[in-house]
């Protein structure tokens, strides 16, 4: 059975992660982890007066 | 085809330890997370943990309820994951399902039934 | 825990008919990075493992059929059949894959007049 991409990259999109889309990738442990369970902090509110850096990265279909 | 095929179950006393396994078909063994779940007679589903894939190094996570005495492995040389049962309780008495974890449980075994009694 | 609530337990409805069932959660399953909610349903028929049907609260699994929908945010989901056949005798299972543990519901048994 064939695997299907595990990510969907946009132009300026963050590299895939090896997350099954189940799970997120914490940056700030270098592992898949449950999306509530990052320990990584949380992006920035939109609106903020700079871009809100890529913390977790969660793989789409 | 996808195919998930647990076996291993059976009668066993309490104090005593029950290793089960899940044989697998039609995917690549190493790309997936696989996870075990049970189900007491008559009751709902309880998650008890999962093994990762080869990219994040086969790492475990584990329901507290049973972590300490289930442990969760793989044989990808054979194509099987298994899981090792000790110090079994009574309340332990459950058909067990191995599956495969993608998007969620995405597919399931038919389930393996294990009795603890003495 | 996150602790799942199905309701109701149990109902009977007629072929034909739609079903609405419901799950809540105690903490929210949004992910608000990705705006998805963690939580996926499941069909267990009498005698058979479970299968699942929805993932990320709304997605429909490849194979089921549409006349299965679910439904929800944050903390409130639900799984609707808009017409009941008879194969849909079984229980229905609600789980978040949001946090570990993984909690599953109790289970809604849907029965056929």
């Known amino acids: 059975m064939r695997r299907g991409p595990r990510s969907l990259r946009g132009r300026d999109a963050p590299a895939p992660t090896p997350c099954v889309p189940a799970e997120c990738f914490d940056l700030l442990v270098r592992h898949c982890v449950a999306c509530g369970a990052l320990r990584t902090p949380r992006p920035k509110p939109a609106g903020a007066s700079s871009p809100a850096p890529r913390t977790a990265l969660q793989p789409q279909e | 085809e996808v195919k998930l095929v647990e076996s291993g179950g059976g009668l066993v006393q309490p104090g005593g330890s029950l290793r089960l396994s899940c044989a697998i078909s039609?995917?690549?063994?190493?790309?997936?997370?696989m996870s075990w779940v049970r189900q007491p007679p008559g009751k709902a589903l309880e998650w008890l943990g999962f093994?990762?894939?080869?990219?994040?190094?086969?790492?475990?996570e584990y329901n507290p309820s049973v972590k300490g005495r289930f442990t969760i492995s793989r044989d990808n040389s054979q194509s099987i994951f298994y899981l090792q049962m000790n110090t079994l309780r009574a309340e332990d008495s459950a058909t067990y399902y191995c599956?495969?974890?993608?998007?969620?449980?995405?597919?399931w075994g038919q389930g393996t039934t294990v009795t603890v009694s003495a | 825990d996150i602790v799942m609530s199905q309701s109701p337990s149990s109902l009977a409805v007629s072929v034909g008919e739609k079903v609405t069932m419901s799950c809540k959660s105690s903490?929210?399953?949004?992910?608000?990075?990705?705006?998805?909610?963690?939580l996926a349903w499941y069909q267990q028929k009498p005698g058979q493992s479970p299968k699942l049907l929805i993932y990320?609260?709304?997605t429909r699994e490849s194979g089921v059929p549409d006349r299965f929908t679910g439904s929800g945010s944050g903390t409130d989901f639900t799984l609707t059949i808009s017409s009941v056949k008879a194969e849909d005798l079984a229980v229905y299972y609600c789980?978040?894959?949001?946090?570990?543990?993984?909690?599953f519901g109790g289970g809604t048994k849907l029965e056929i007049k």
């Open positions: 599956a495969q974890v993608r998007r969620a449980l995405d597919y």
């Open positions: 039609g995917f690549t063994v190493t790309a997936y997370y």
């Open positions: 093994i990762r894939d080869k990219a994040n190094g086969y790492t475990t």
């Open positions: 903490q929210s399953l949004l992910y608000s990075s990705n705006q998805n909610n963690y």
């Open positions: 990320w609260a709304s």
């Open positions: 789980q978040q894959y949001y946090t570990y543990p993984y909690t």
